[in-house]
Amino acid sequence: ESALITQQDLAPQQRAAPQQKRSSPSEGLCPPGHHISEDGRDCISCKYGQDYSTHWNDLLFCLRCTRCDSGEVELSPCTTTRNTVCQCEEGTFREEDSPEMCRKCRTGCPRGMVKVGDCTPWSDIECVHKESGTKHSGEVPAVEETVTSSPGTPASPCSLSG
């Protein structure tokens, strides 16, 4: 490593604001709830309710707290070490492939299908075919979801569109 010279401008952003307590980094890293100063000499606390950091880090800034959207409820507020936890309101859910918004759960299953799973904040109601126990999506259900078919009726996937 080349020897380094450091020169500090006294800009307001570099001075510790009253609410931003400082401590020294450990092996170049600051603990959760802090970020590092530009010169790497200080750990500056995140601002409660505004930003946070969850891990030991050498980042110049804390991460901005998530604001729950309308249609979401706040399960736990943002702290200096943990982001806000938001959850879809009752009757709505968030899909993995479209996590940006809460969607309304279906009110019932299509004809010929039976409900085996309720609406939760992370999943729609789950429907299986009355006869075969096949999920509405066409997937073969897990063992605990299987609907017992009557004797002599082979369990085969049914093709349902929609």
């Epitope: 500090q8 401008d9 980042l59």
Partner: nanobody, 123 residues
Framework: EVQLLESGGGEVQPGGSLRLSCAAS????????MSWFRQAPGKEREFVSA????????YYAESVKGRFTISRDNAKNTLYLQMSSLRAEDTAVYYC????????????????WGQGTQVTVKP
């Protein structure tokens, strides 16, 4: 998308001067450091100088101290390196880089790099 575009390189005689520029776009971080690194043929990329956008903290490698000056224009989002008293050993490709880490003088702490501009010092 972060983009860095260096300019100002060229050929100069020993003792001469050059001013490098690095125009940055797509930077939306609350604070970041911008640096100059250089790489001579057959050698590893080495740190030259850094400046932090928010507080203005500045770093120089010992080898360029007193000869090179780093500066920034916040309004233009542009980084500069004024190089004077140039020597043959300053010959290299000069790269502009951006980090969101503190006290960053190692290449691995940088996530964004420009394409580089050639500086050649010869009689």
């Amino acid at each position: 998308e972060v983009q860095l575009l260096e300019s100002g390189g060229g050929e100069v005689q020993p003792g001469g001067s050059l001013r490098l520029s690095c125009a940055a776009s797509g930077l939306t971080f609350p604070n970041y450091g911008m640096s100059w690194f250089r790489q001579a043929p057959g050698k590893e990329r080495e740190f030259v100088s850094a400046i932090y956008w928010s507080g203005g903290t500045v770093y120089y490698a010992e080898s360029v101290k007193g000869r090179f000056t780093i500066s920034r224009d916040n309004a233009k989002n542009t980084l500069y390196l004024q190089m004077s008293s140039l020597r043959a050993e300053d010959t290299a490709v000069y790269y502009c880089a951006v980090t969101i880490r503190g006290a960053a003088t190692q290449t691995w702490k940088y996530d964004y790099w420009g394409q580089g501009t050639q500086v050649t010092v010869k009689p």
